[in-house]
């Protein structure tokens, strides 16, 4: 806190300008209005005032604005910004997406700090829903910004915002939010053609049912062995070996490497060793010939 | 990304030094630099300034007339020449850059010790 002093003779601040980084912190706080402040905001990004300087220029604003700055401010704060606290950022009013990319700028390149996560929270909870203008803006920002979110948080994206969302985007989301995705995907997509629409999907696929991968299987995709292994286990187990055989097409080899891990080798375990070694692909682990197979499930089911 | 000061060191009042800011990294072309000293105990304060485009300087009071501070873009490098010092010149002296509207990028630099004692 710096102790309120008369502004000696002639350092009355007329504009925000270079000559204020000779101001001692005391000076700044007697010297310089805030309101002026406030209208010239623009101009301290320019100045390379210290951080010690940089605290009362804050001090300052939030003197002249308790109830949280407006938006004209805001946009200006440029690296004003990194002082800012969760709590300062939870009395904001931000709109504009202009002014959601400038605050980001200004964090550009570093890890997604609290307050960037509370300015977000904020954002989007004043427009309601995550539209494609703002999802482009905060995926390109931070690519991993999706899977940041919980399912119940991703419920509120709306089918056309998918068409923002780049493979890259989803890279750290797990099973539980693309089962939340897929769906929208599916939906966002559904007008393309065969190729064009599995090029589309198939980054959101972790999140696919079992009847979607078969009816995959019909169209001569060639999914890629690192697609497949991110499908649910649940979903590939009901899947045949001429389906499988069908889904990955010329990459059907690469399951040996993979016999082993997940959703391969439940996959194995539930497929006749028959039906595996037609692959062959050297497969082991299959039901031997001449076993029952009894799905206990569809018994429990019945009784 | 970073700000790298030299040129400090040890010399007697009345005497030079040449301080130099150095940007690795980046381009310092588009960033007004501020140079910045500390005294043991004191607080920061700036000592000069020189815009993005080198056309205007300027000058805390207490070193107007002593102080020049210049830059040369195609050496990333913008320079502080320091005559007739004085013992109340002794401190860290840091550079910082800062990047002006549509670019908050700014940074700061370690610092260089001048210590001006008879």
């Known amino acids: 806190e710096v102790e309120k002093t008369a502004c000696p003779s002639g350092k009355k601040a007329r504009e925000i300008d270079e000559s204020l980084i000779f101001y001692k912190k005391w000076e700044l706080e007697a010297c310089v209005d805030a309101a002026l402040l406030a209208t010239q905001m623009d101009r301290v990004n320019a100045i390379p005032f210290t951080y010690e300087q940089l605290d009362v220029l804050k001090h300052k604003l939030d003197e002249l604005y308790p109830q949280g700055y407006p938006e004209s401010v805001i946009q200006h704060l440029g690296y004003l910004f990194l002082k800012m606290s969760p709590e300062d950022i939870r009395k904001w009013n931000v709109t504009s997406l202009e002014t959601l990319k400038a605050l980001l700028e200004v964090n550009k390149g570093h890890e997604m700090s609290p307050q960037v996560a509370t300015l977000i929270d904020r954002f989007v909870k004043g427009r309601g829903q995550l539209d494609k203008d703002t999802l482009d803006t905060l995926t390109a920002f931070y690519p991993g910004y999706l899977c940041s979110l919980s399912p119940e948080e991703l419920s509120s994206v709306p089918p056309s915002s998918i068409w923002a969302v780049r493979p890259q985007d989803l890279d750290t989301c797990d099973p539980r939010q693309l089962d939340v995705l897929y769906p929208k995907a599916r939906l966002a997509f559904q007008n393309m053609n065969g190729s064009e629409y599995f090029v589309k999907i198939q980054s959101f696929l972790g999140g696919a049912p079992t009847e979607d991968l078969k009816a995959l299987s019909q169209q001569n995709v060639s999914m890629d062995l690192a697609t497949f292994m991110k499908l649910r286990t649940d979903a590939v187990l009901p899947l045949t070996v001429a389906e499988v055989q069908k889904l990955l097409g010329p990459h059907v080899e690469g399951l040996k490497a993979e016999e082993r891990h997940r959703p391969v080798r439940d996959w194995i375990l539930r497929q006749r060793q028959d039906d595996l070694d037609t692959l062959g692909l050297g497969l082991q682990g299959g039901i031997p010939n001449g076993y029952l197979v009894l799905d206990l499930s569809m018994q429990e089911a019945l009784s | 990304l970073q700000l790298v000061e030299s040129g400090g060191g040890l010399d007697q009042p009345g005497g030079s030094l040449r301080l130099s800011c150095a940007a690795s990294g980046f381009t310092l072309d588009y960033y007004a630099i501020g140079w910045f000293r500390q005294a043991p105990g004191k607080e920061r304060e700036g000592v000069s300034y020189?815009?993005?485009?080198?056309?205007?300087?300027n000058y805390a009071d207490s070193v107007k007339g002593r102080f020049t501070i210049s830059r040369d873009n195609a050496k990333n490098t913008v320079y502080l020449q320091m005559n007739s010092l004085k013992p109340e010149d002794t401190g860290v002296y840091s550079c910082?850059?800062?990047?002006?509207?549509?670019?908050?990028?700014?940074?700061w630099g370690q610092g260089t010790s001048v210590t001006v004692s008879s």
């Open positions: 910082a850059a800062a990047g002006g509207y549509g670019n908050s990028s700014r940074y």
């Open positions: 020189i815009s993005s485009s080198g056309g205007s300087t």
